[in-house]
């Protein structure tokens, strides 16, 4: 039970008091009592509950006609069973005994309030009006925990605006409302108490930034809302009438959780004693709810596909029947950036992830727009976010990114248990360097602050400055599988090539050609690559690179080899030795449920086929997946990138539930 | 063959900025590596930074680092200096230079390491 | 001071050869197959001449040729002529923080 206040009894003159129903208040009965008594017994009207402890010894008795002794070890404590009809309806009688005089009374007279702050703390998508209890005071994580959730109100239902609906102090409609958590003050009063007692509603001046309170006033026409508390207003005095009362409040969050905003926003109300005009207000009473905003949650490739993002480029028109027919597969609606839109710019997935929110009452996907700000920079924010379609950013706005801070390095797994700890959610993973030094690339550290403040989805940095472009979705995916831990990690593997092209030669095809069908392109015969020394020590390098992230990813994501399917690839190092696909890099590519658009490598035709396809195919189709080979030499490979890097996809949130996860 | 136009240069003074552009003509810069390279007067050259086709990675000069950002827009097909906290030893010809990316070569060919073409230079002058 | 070191200047009569050196460390010259030299002529941009120790572009004469040993490069220009008469730069990639370096530079004077 919350605690309530402490009241002081004196025989000099009665004593007035307030006591909010649902709090333990504490009477102090000795510090006025009559110098010649040594004892005290106590009466109240039938709405009082009176507790006395005596400690040593630690006697509990009920009141009656018992007689206690006036000593410090004396707690006296009173609840009320009911909200009073008029001020002062309910009292309590001290009488002081002594051994030589008669009685001496203190009179209390007390009024009963019902105050209390409810908010959806069970995490049922309902609020139900809960007693002034301690335990809204504190938020915790997990499936037995409680705490209400917050969403960032993100997403701009007004398409005629250009802001966010967090960034204007105006509730647009009642869609505006659902992106926004209810909060209901209830009060219970005798009609007159409001005309000596006030109630103000506050927060943290640490957290008024974070958050915004909007007040619903019910007019005959509509429901309208106002701004009460705010960046601009970390407090407001409510207006509340005598009597019942339920008074609705919408709580936005207008700011993720990051480095130095935990994400717990704590919003209080608070009764004024004001009844003496010519003292300060005093307060009686404070009752809090505590919130927690909803963090930004990525979504693997193991989770259904539901939208699939492109750019139209010049002469990329095979590659976009490929992808339409890829997602008309896996029933995904798909969406098309035209060229006057992403000004030659095709790298999709380098500029945002798509994640989401969600509360219990509302989901809602948020697209996390990359600093790297190309010629795509305007989609995300023009074309994505929209109407229950959330957006974020973080980092640099102009200059001082590095390769790093696209996204095609950054990456979810799916859920793993890793020991006793589980992530129902994934790990992110992202690229970085080794070690620092002048010339290394790493993801900006406001980047990295963000994504480690969600807490959900707990990050493991990869290793992936090795590489030209420096992205993890260079070497890493993953896919859906039937059975084990319901994914495969995919890793490129220039050791399983080798030994490919090796078992190949041994079969007599070593003339076979790489690159066969490119045009401009010097076609590669099997032998000349397994005899070209250089390639091999580039490889071997890429090897190592490749296995330092292997081990990480199995001590981090708790994965056995038999979790992990070697790709078949082959590196060059390039200058300032990073290194890149020497031939379409398989592993990059786009998975919408079982089916898979994958970069044709234009390996060597051996009996009619592909042998590095084949081989992929063996690999992924025993798993139910089915494998597309998609063409994206000339328009994407050449240019550093494959078919994951020109694609993005929006995804089903879990079912799982993040509140019910302890990070 | 591409062909390369520095300018921005200019008298400046000491601590103040400048941005160098180079632009390109005859061919596409997005293939081309680019470096930035200096020429004091009268002294030897200096290679000052680097900026790789997939515009992912830079690098720069010991004598540089922290003051000079290298960047490029290919969709303007040009590469930029941004030159800032200038010294009165910067003072010198800064000459663009490039190289082209041959996705064909099966291993390293060095092509960041040289510079086959080159602009004729932009003057820089840093003087209180 | 210069990373790599050449002498500062060379000369010889039309239809000689000379050769000119650079010198560097394990870490530079000594470490990697990217050595290029440049020929400046006054008031001009440098031209690349060679590449990778001994590759030629295209358009550049077989007089000049490359070769490397050890931690040293040399630049050979046989059978001289008098537009030959310039500086020439020797440059290495290098596995220091500043990853291209240069050489002083040698003025070739033509007799």
């Known amino acids: 039970m919350a605690q309530g206040t402490l009241i002081r009894v004196t025989p000099e003159q009665p004593t007035h008091a307030v006591c909010v129903l649902g709090t333990l208040t504490q009477l102090d009965v000795c510090s006025s009592a009559p110098e010649d008594c040594t004892s005290f017994s106590v009466n109240t009207s039938p709405g009082v509950v009176v507790d006395i402890a005596h400690s040593p010894p630690a006697k509990k008795k009920s009141t009656g006609s018992s007689t206690w002794p006036l000593d410090p070890g004396v707690e006296v404590t009173l609840t009320m069973k009911a909200a009073s009809g008029s001020t002062g309806d309910q009292k309590v009688q001290i009488s002081y005994h002594g051994p030589k005089t008669p009685p001496v009374k203190a009179l209390l007279y007390l009024t009963g309030v019902e105050i209390s702050l409810s908010a959806d703390i069970t995490r049922t998508g309902k609020v139900k009006p809960t007693r002034a209890v301690e335990d809204k005071r504190t938020w915790t994580w997990g499936p037995c925990g409680q705490g209400a959730i917050l969403l960032v109100n993100c997403d701009r239902d007004n398409p005629e605006s250009s802001a966010m609906d967090c960034e204007d102090d105006e509730v647009l409609d009642s869609k505006d409302l659902k992106d926004m958590s209810l909060m209901t003050l209830s009060t219970k009063t005798p009609q007159d108490f409001f005309t000596r007692h006030t109630l103000v509603l506050h927060v943290a001046r640490s957290e008024m930034d974070k958050v915004r309170v909007f007040q619903a006033t019910r007019g005959r026409l509509s429901s309208r809302c106002r701004v009460v508390l705010g960046p601009k207003q970390p407090s407001h005095y409510l207006m509340v009438p005598g009597g019942k009362h339920n008074m609705d409040f919408y709580v936005e969050a207008l700011a993720f959780p990051d480095t130095n905003f935990p994400g717990l926003i704590t919003l209080t109300v608070s009764m004024l004693d004001t009844s003496k005009l010519e003292l300060p207000e005093a307060v009686v009473f404070q009752d809090s709810v505590v919130f927690r905003v909803a963090p930004w949650i990525m979504t693997p490739n193991t989770q259904p596909p539901q939208e699939v993002y492109v750019c139209s480029i010049f002469e990329n028109e095979d590659f976009l029947k490929s992808v339409t027919a890829l997602a008309m597969q896996a029933r995904c609606k798909l969406t098309i950036c035209p060229e006057e839109e992403n000004m030659d710019d095709q790298w999709m997935q380098d500029e945002m992830e798509i994640g989401y929110i969600q509360a219990p009452h509302k989901t809602l996907p948020v697209v996390f727009d990359s600093p790297r700000n190309r010629g795509l920079k305007e989609f995300p924010i023009k074309r994505v976010m929209g109407p229950d379609f959330g957006y974020v950013t973080r980092g640099p706005q102009t200059g001082g990114v590095s390769g790093l801070d696209s996204f095609g390095n950054l990456e979810v797994s799916p859920p793993v248990t890793v020991g006793d700890k589980e992530y129902p959610l994934g790990r992110i993973l992202f690229g970085d360097s080794c070690y620092p030094s002048s010339d290394s690339r790493e993801m900006h550290q406001a980047l990295q602050d963000f994504l480690s403040a969600q807490q959900v989805q707990a990050p493991v940095k990869l290793y992936s400055d090795w590489l030209t472009v420096g992205h993890v979705d260079e070497f890493l995916s993953f896919v859906p599988a039937p059975d084990r831990k319901g994914f495969r990690l995919l890793l490129a593997s220039p050791r399983s090539c080798y030994k490919l092209f090796q078992e190949q030669q041994n079969e007599g095809h070593g003339d076979a050609l790489l690159f066969q069908g490119i045009k401009k392109k010097n076609q590669q015969k099997i032998k000349n690559i397994l005899s070209n020394t250089t390639l091999r020590e580039h490889n071997s390098f890429v090897e190592r690179c490749i296995d330092w992230n292997r081990e990480l990813l199995k001590r981090e994501l708790g994965l056995a080899e038999s979790d992990i399917i070697d790709i078949p690839q082959l590196f060059k190092l390039k200058e300032f030795s990073k290194a890149e696909a020497f031939f379409p890099n398989m592993v990059n590519m786009l998975v919408l449920g079982k089916h898979l658009g994958i970069p044709k490598p234009f390996g060597p035709i051996i009996n009619g086929r592909c042998c590095l396809e084949e081989k992929v195919c063996s690999l992924l189709e025993p798993l139910g997946l089915h494998c597309t080979f998609i063409n994206d030499f000339y328009t994407y490979h050449i240019r550093h990138g494959e078919v994951h890097c020109g694609t993005n996809v929006r995804r089903k949130p879990f079912s799982f539930k993040w509140w019910n996860m302890v990070p | 063959q591409v062909q390369l136009v520095e300018s921005g240069g200019g008298l400046v003074k000491p601590g103040g900025s400048l941005r160098l552009s180079c632009a390109a003509s005859?061919?596409?810069?997005?293939?081309?590596?680019v470096s930035w390279i200096r020429q004091a007067p009268g002294k030897g050259l200096e290679w000052v930074s680097f900026?790789?086709?997939?515009?992912?990675?830079?690098y720069y000069a010991d004598s540089v680092r922290g003051r000079f950002t290298i960047s490029r827009d290919n969709a303007k097909n040009s590469v930029y200096l941004q030159m800032n906290s200038l010294r009165a030893e910067d003072t010198a010809v800064y000459y663009c230079?490039?190289?082209?990316?041959?996705?064909?070569?099966?291993?390293?060919?060095?092509?960041?390491?040289?510079?086959?073409?080159w602009g004729r230079g932009t003057l820089v002058t840093v003087s209180s | 001071q210069s990373a790599l070191t050449q002498p500062r200047s060379v000369s010889g009569s039309p239809g000689q050869s000379v050769t000119i050196s650079c010198t560097g460390t394990?870490?530079?010259?000594?470490?990697?197959?990217?050595v290029s030299w440049y020929q400046q002529h006054p008031g001009k941009a440098p031209k690349l001449i060679i590449y990778n120790v001994y590759e030629r572009p295209s358009g550049v004469p077989d007089r000049f040729s490359g070769s490397k040993s050890g931690n040293t490069a040399s630049l050979t220009i046989s059978g001289l002529q008098a537009e030959d008469e310039a500086d020439y730069y020797c440059?290495?990639?290098?596995?220091?923080?500043?990853?291209?370096?240069f050489g002083g530079g040698t003025k070739l004077t033509v007799l």
């Open positions: 900026i790789n086709t997939a515009n992912t990675f830079t």
């Open positions: 230079s490039s190289a082209n990316d041959d996705v064909d070569d099966i291993v390293a060919p060095g092509r960041g390491y040289y510079m086959d073409v």
């Open positions: 394990s870490g530079d010259v000594g470490r990697y197959s990217h």
């Open positions: 005859g061919s596409t810069l997005s293939d081309y590596f």
């Open positions: 440059s290495s990639h290098s596995r220091s923080s500043t990853p291209v370096l």
